[in-house]
Each structure stands twice: as C-alpha cells, then as structure tokens.
C-alpha cells in the first residue's frame, strides 16, 4: 500500500512540476523592470524567453517576439534548450509513469516491467527537474550579471533591440515558478525511484517456499503470481500483516524499520 501511495504521489507531484515548467517556459516575465526606487519611466518592460513586452501606464500592453535565432545571446539559447529538454523528458516520463502505475492494469504486464518503468520515469523526472532548475538558475545569473546596465539591456543585438535608457532588470515571476516547478519534478522523480524499490521482485535462489501462517498456507513462487489472500497481485512477493511488510525470510519475525517504504 505504501508503495502504491509513494508511486501515486510521485506521479502527481511530477505532473504538477512539469505543468509548472511548461508554464514558466511560456511566461513573459522572466525578467522585469526594476521598480525599487519608484517608477522612473511611464512604461514597464518585462521579458521572457520568446518575446519582450511593454506595458504603458494606461494598461496597454505590447509584446514583440524575438524574430531572430542567430542574433540571440548563447546564454538565452542555452536556457531555452534546457527548458525544452526538461519539458520533453518530463512529458515522456509522465507517459511512461502512467503505464507503470500500480493501480493501473495493462494486460498481463509483469511486475518487474512496472518496476523498470517506474525507475525510468523517476530518472526522467529527476533529469527534467534538474534541467529546469539549471535553466532558471543560468537566466538568474545572467540577470544578476547585467543588473547594473548603462545604455543597453541584456539582449543587446537581439534583432536590433537596443535599450537606450538606463533600465535595470530584476527577477520575474517565471523564475520563481521555474525553481518551484523544477524542485517538485525532482522530488516526484525521487519518489518514483523509491517506489521502484518497493515494486521490484526479490531475487531468490530457490524455486518455492512453503510456510504456515494464520492457520492457512500459501505457496509462493517467484514471478507474476496472484496469492489467494485477497490482495490481488502482490508485486514484492510479500504478505501484509498489521501494516508490517515481511518477505518470505521474515515471516516469523516482527516488522523492522527496514520493512516500511
């Protein structure tokens, strides 16, 4: 039960995280005009990975895409790449993890296959989260480096976009969304990897084990086997008693701290 909960929670956390990474990547507010000392200009500038926007004091907002690829700074291209890789890996991870979920039955899928898929999706989520965190951090570092600007903004040469006033840019909302989302995806991935350990069948050197417990006997055989205990497929060849998960070798012992996932 703990394994299923861990896996399900890992999936949900990763799903939220990846949705956040997608949202951050699409957001326009990666960098926003610094208004620390009252507004100096009657326009508010903010920039994303794909376009820059200007909001006038009337509320009128105008956004312009960066209609150039070669003219963009390498750092911005790197951030775009990291975020896209993060999204792609996360999306694939979500797809894989759906089929790996213990609560979903697809044909006669082996428990070992589900365990492998859970681990694969977990690793994908971890890498996805790291990509997002790295991308956001690179952009944040770029902002800090460019904080005190004189006449050109951080995208000098971006399709001829030269800022001719002293505009300072600070962290936009997208950075915080990206950091949190990346962290959630990372946590979700770790949870999936932990759940994988609980799903993987134990390797044994013997064919079968017979034992007596609670007045009835159950014969366990390695592999995809449904025990007649009412629990459905028992993917770790375990029987659950009073919340304590015990392997064949531990049937007569009390639950130890290692028994809980």
């Amino acid at each position: 039960m703990a394994v299923t909960a861990c896996q399900g929670l890992g999936f949900v956390v990763s799903l939220i995280g990846i949705a956040g990474i997608i949202a951050a990547t699409c957001m326009d507010q990666w960098s926003t005009q610094d208004l620390y000392n009252n507004p100096v200009t009657a326009v508010f500038n903010y920039q994303g990975l794909w376009r820059s926007c200007v909001r006038e004091s009337s509320g009128f907002t105008e956004c312009r895409g960066y209609f150039t690829l070669l003219g963009l700074p390498a750092m911005l291209q790197a951030v775009r790449a990291l975020m896209i890789v993060g999204i792609v890996l996360g999306a694939i991870g979500l797809l894989v993890s759906i089929f790996a979920l213990k609560c979903i039955r697809i044909g006669s899928m082996e428990d070992s296959a589900k365990a492998n898929m859970t681990l694969t999706s977990g690793i994908m989520f971890i890498v996805s989260g790291l990509c997002a965190i790295a991308g956001v951090s690179v952009f944040a570092n770029m902002l800090v480096t460019n904080f005190w600007m004189s006449t050109a903004n951080m995208y000098t040469g971006m399709g001829g976009m030269v800022q001719t006033v002293q505009t300072r840019y600070t962290f936009g909302a997208a950075l915080f969304v990206g950091w949190v989302a990346g962290g959630l995806t990372l946590i979700g991935g770790v949870m999936m990897c932990i759940a994988c350990r609980g799903l993987a069948p134990e390797e044994t050197n013997y064919k079968a084990v017979s034992y007596h417990a609670s007045g009835h006997s159950v014969a366990y055989k390695p592999g995809g086997f449904k025990a007649s205990t009412g629990f459905g497929s028992n993917t770790k060849n375990k029987k659950i008693y009073d919340g304590g998960a015990r392997t064949e070798d531990e049937v007569q012992s009390y639950p130890s701290k290692h028994d809980y996932v």
């Epitope: 507004p39 100096v40 200009t41 009657a42 326009v43 500038n45 920039q47 820059s52 926007c53 200007v54 006038e56 004091s57 009337s58 509320g59 009128f60 105008e62 312009r64 050109a152 903004n153 001829g160 976009m161 030269v162 800022q163 001719t164 006033v165 505009t167």
Partner: antibody, heavy 119, light 113 residues
Framework: EVQLQQSGPELVKPGTSVKMSCKAS????????MHWVKLSHGKSLEWIGY????????IYNQRFKGKATLTVNKSSRTAYMDLRSLTSEDSAVYYC????????????WGQGNSVTVSS | DIVMTQSPSSLTVTPGERVTMSCKSS????????????LTWYQQKPGQPPKLLIY???TRESGVPDRFAGSGSGTDFTLTISRVQAEDLSFYYC?????????FGSGTKLDLR
C-alpha cells in the same frame, strides 16, 4: 462623446486653498488615468501628475508634491485637484486631461480652469 | 527632469507652404522593449485646451489631417505640416511621455503671413 467638464474660474487670496473639479462623461471613468496640467501666462505647459480612478493611485511631479493633491469620486465620475498655500505663482489655467490608451498621451482635455491668486 | 527644447520659438508662413519644427530631448525617448519613441505632439489654439496630434513620435491621432506628420527617433524629433492652412495658426508643443515627470517643450508659435 467624451467630455471633461471643469469647474468655473476662481479668484482666491494668497495662503488659501482651492479645490477644482473635472466631471467626466461619455466613457468608462475608471478605465482611464486622469492627468492635470498647468498653463501659466507666458510660460509652457507643466505636468502636475495623474490619478488612476480605479484604485486612487497617483504619480506626481516632484515640483507639485505638497502643493497639489489629486483625488477622485468614482460614483460621481469626478476628478479633483486641491491646491494649497496659494501664491501668485499658482495663478494659471489648470487643465484636466484623460490619458489615451496609446503612447501615454492625453487625448481629451477639459476646457481649463482659471485660478487667480490676488490679495 | 528631461528638458525638451523646441525650435524655432515662432514661425511665419504663407498658406500652402510646407513647415517643419524641431524638438530635442535631453535623453533618448526610445524604449528598447517595443522600439517606440515616447514623444507626443499637441496643438493649442488661443483660448482652447491643447489637442492631441501625434503620439509615439509618428502615429497620427484619429481625426487629425494627414498633412500633419511626425518623425524622428531617440532625442531628435520633427513635426511637419505639408500644406499649412489658416486654421493651423496655433502653438505646437512636444511632450516627453516616457520619463516621469512628463515635460513639455516651450512651444513653437505658428503665425500666418
């Protein structure tokens, strides 16, 4: 039709205060900022500041901070400017002007309110 | 504060003539984010409030005759009236609509011969 109707001319004594009004009609009052501009005799236009009628937020020209106070009454669709501690330097025509949607420009102006400070 | 310098202070022209007036700002009014110049031109006839002619340095306000044209970028701007008419007898003001506080030029007075 957009109209900004300003209150009548004022003849006031030095050291006193005056509160002028600007009643808006023909548009959604809370959707547009209201600016105030001073035109002194023989001088150019001077921007005093503006108020956002939706939230009451103001931005002033530092030169007029402490001299002018901008307020609005949303229900009566009226903007007000309070001028205090008046001197002969404050004798001028004061305009209210609606901020247009583009370019931070002022697209509609009131007819002006003449203020004369004299003892 | 941004200083707006208009020249000449007055112009005497004959109807049908082409006229240009200049406006210079002490700082660039070009915003890099949208590549727009935040300079506005107003016309003020005697005894009347100012009237918006041009915003974003070159965009004509609706209802303004096409003989009025604004140009320039950064710090140097020009208002051109291609064929002056009698009703154009006015003061023309340029305004910085980028930096707070908004500032106006001293104006150019257009007189007809």
């Amino acid at each position: 039709e957009v109209q900004l109707q300003q209150s009548g001319p004022e003849l006031v004594k030095p050291g006193t205060s005056v509160k002028m009004s600007c009643k808006a009609s023909g548009y959604t009052f809370t959707d547009y900022n209201m600016h105030w501009v001073k035109l002194s005799h023989g001088k150019s236009l001077e921007w005093i500041g503006y108020i956002n009628p939706n939230n009451g937020g103001t931005i002033y020209n530092q030169r007029f901070k402490g001299k002018a106070t901008l307020t609005v009454n949303k229900s009566s669709r009226t903007a007000y400017m309070d001028l205090r501690s008046l001197t002969s330097e404050d004798s001028a025509v004061y305009y209210c002007a609606r901020q247009g949607y583009y370019g931070n420009s002022m697209d509609y102006w009131g007819q002006g309110n003449s203020v004369t400070v004299s003892s | 504060d941004i200083v707006m310098t208009q020249s000449p202070s007055s112009l005497t022209v004959t109807p049908g003539e082409r006229v240009t007036m200049s406006c210079k700002s002490s700082q660039s009014l070009l915003n890099g984010g949208n590549q727009r110049n935040y300079l506005t031109w107003y016309q003020q006839k005697p005894g009347q409030p100012p009237k918006l002619l041009i915003y974003w340095a070159s965009t004509r306000e609706s209802g303004v005759p096409d003989r009025f044209a604004g140009s320039g970028s950064g710090t140097d701007f020009t208002l051109t009236i291609s064929r002056v008419q009698a009703e154009d007898l006015s003061f023309y003001y340029c305004q910085n609509s980028y930096f707070y506080p908004f500032t106006f030029g001293s104006g150019t007075k257009l007189d007809l011969r």
